[in-house]
Amino acid sequence: AGVFELQIHSFGPGPGPGAPRSPCSARLPCRLFFRVCLKPGLSEEAAESPCALGAALSARGPVYTEQPGAPAPDLPLPDGLLQVPFRDAWPGTFSFIIETWREELGDQIGGPAWSLLARVAGRRRLAAGGPWARDIQRAGAWELRFSYRARCEPPAVGTACTRLCRPRSAPSRCGPGLRPCAPLEDECEAPLVCRAGCSPEHGFCEQPGECRCLEGWTGPLCTVPVSTSSCLSPRGPSSATTGCLVPGPGPCDGNPCANGGSCSETPRSFECTCPRGFYGLRCEVSGVTCADGPCFNGGLCVGGADPDSAYICHCPPGFQGSNCEKRVDRCSLQPCRNGGLCLDLGHALRCRCRAGFAGPRCEHDLDDCAGRACANGGTCVEGGGAHRCSCALGFGGRDCRERADPCAARPCAHGGRCYAHFSGLVCACAPGYMGARCEFPVHPDGASALPAAPPGLRPGDPQRYL
């Protein structure tokens, strides 16, 4: 176990032309915060894929207001380190994503607005216990300068935090073949050596000489990937040739839970139910009580004060797991209707609604037809967060209260004269034309072009347009 630490030194415009505009203004003051996401190995995974090694969010930085006319300077940063605890061995190779977020502090409806300013990513090799590594990454016109390191939490030591240190049994020296644990010179390295050849990336051990595999790997030395598509031969599954099984061994095969813990498969991983007095991803940590603070993310610990009594973490909304270590993104399925913005506040979901909508999930159309009357026989039509009236002939305007001039658009063709009428308009056609809008020429022999004149109407009579 250990902690990955990230120190942000500066975030501001990068060198070269095209300096970015300041993200904050006098009208919209804002402050920055950072998110780091770590994944094991040198994978080039999508930014959305899980942060399998862990993730952390910084505190909010100081409020910043742009000075008018000044170029964007290095922006004020949050205090402190970003710390990502890891429970198992440090993988040595890792991928990172660092995101810079802006929190606008103007008069926002429903709380502050967040937007992603920049995202940088990289793949690095890093030994635990080493010095701070410095880095510069650019995202568009922005530049991020930072340092990072991985350090082991006692009693773990070593480049992967897999060796354990124990207090000396004798005051003067360590036992045969055991070295002092630098920098803890008063402690000695515990004799924990995994089976020779055990994969340092995919295997681990909790007892000397063993080699236990992380999920996705199998074989005596954890060097064989399981459940890959190459396992299928034309005659069906074959484990002899490829060393893999289909269906692949489940994550609970071989029981990764230590100290008598029982394993259950979860949708994508496994979970250990630990006996009293143990906790951790694999029940590897002993003698834990509520006094040790085993519940993460604000979980409430309930249990006895002595190491033999079990504790239970009651997780706040948005977290789960035996130690409330798993975060749930409840906005993932877009619960906010009508284009509302979803905010997972931890204790609750909140929707910031677009103009024209309201309600806990933005489900209410404020401008709908409820209680809206269209005058003079008009009918109300809903749509897009607004309502409109479809007006009866002779009326117009938002609520059909205005008398429309049906002749305004000059509807009578070929010089016909237009007369407003209570049910619409009437065209008095010029000689030689007929039809509701005087659109049909009259032939010399008295026959008209299609359509035929209605009975009782002579060419040249006024035509009522309904």
Epitope: P50, S229, E265, P267, R268, E271, G321, V328, D329, S332
Partner: antibody
């Protein structure tokens, strides 16, 4: 628009192997967070989860049927295939495939879109 | 295995009634999922992550609960709500469903 459709034989004989294909559109199994699962429902009975597969090829099987089930995906064809060996009349059911979404490492957000289902009868 | 027990197994109610269906799990878990199924049709997601309404589901449906006891509530029954309702847990394999609650017109 997201759709899923199950296809396969409607009648199989006891001891035979059933192969069902789920063809989907509107999402991709190369996208992080996406999965496809199989669920069945014997006539007049409750739903039973069988298996699922994730974008990164992590698979899960119902323990009581694990020895008989295999789930695979063909990302380029937008298909997931479930094979079930040694069929028995008690396996007669409507078989559904459904999209599963997980935006967190180990928490299912939802099984939000389902196919119409295909009725498979096991009889000699 | 986590057993999911729904109650009641069947229920008669009238349009406009407030209806509550409960689902009890044999061991504690974090989230519940609810589905509605009509005869001859595929199940439809109603509630995910215990209390979140799926897209297109009317706001008269709501979900609540934690630990082992979870509830689906329909605030005012509509004719189209008469169907069978299932709960499901995604905590531990096998990912089990409840036996169903059939909601019928009184």
């Amino acid at each position: 628009q997201i759709t899923l459709k199950e296809s396969g034989p409607t009648l199989v004989k006891p001891t035979q192997t059933l192969t069902l294909t789920c063809t989907f559109s509107g999402f991709s199994l190369s996208t992080s967070g996406m999965g496809v699962g199989w669920i069945r429902q014997p006539p007049g009975k409750a739903l039973e989860w069988l298996a699922h597969i994730w974008w990164d090829d992590v698979k899960r099987y119902s323990p009581s049927l694990k020895s008989r089930l295999t789930i695979t995906k063909d990302t380029s064809k937008n298909q997931v295939v479930l094979t079930m060996t040694n069929m028995d009349p008690v396996d007669t059911a409507t078989y559904y495939c459904a999209r599963i979404v997980s935006f967190d490492n180990d928490v299912v957000s939802a099984m939000d879109y389902w196919g119409q289902g295909t009725l498979v009868t096991v009889s000699s | 295995d986590i057993q999911m027990t729904q109650s009641p197994s069947s229920l008669s109610a009238s349009v406009g009634d407030r209806v509550t269906i409960t689902c009890s799990a044999s061991s504690s878990h974090s989230y519940m999922y609810w589905y509605q199924q009509k005869p001859g049709k595929a199940p439809k997601l109603l509630i995910y992550l215990t209390s979140n309404l799926a897209s297109g589901v009317p706001s008269r449906f709501s979900g609540s609960g934690s630990g082992t006891d979870f509830t689906l509530t329909i605030s005012s029954l509509q004719p189209e709500d008469f169907a069978t309702y299932y709960c499901q847990q995604w905590r531990s394999n096998p990912f089990t469903f409840g036996q169903g609650t059939k909601l019928e017109i009184k």
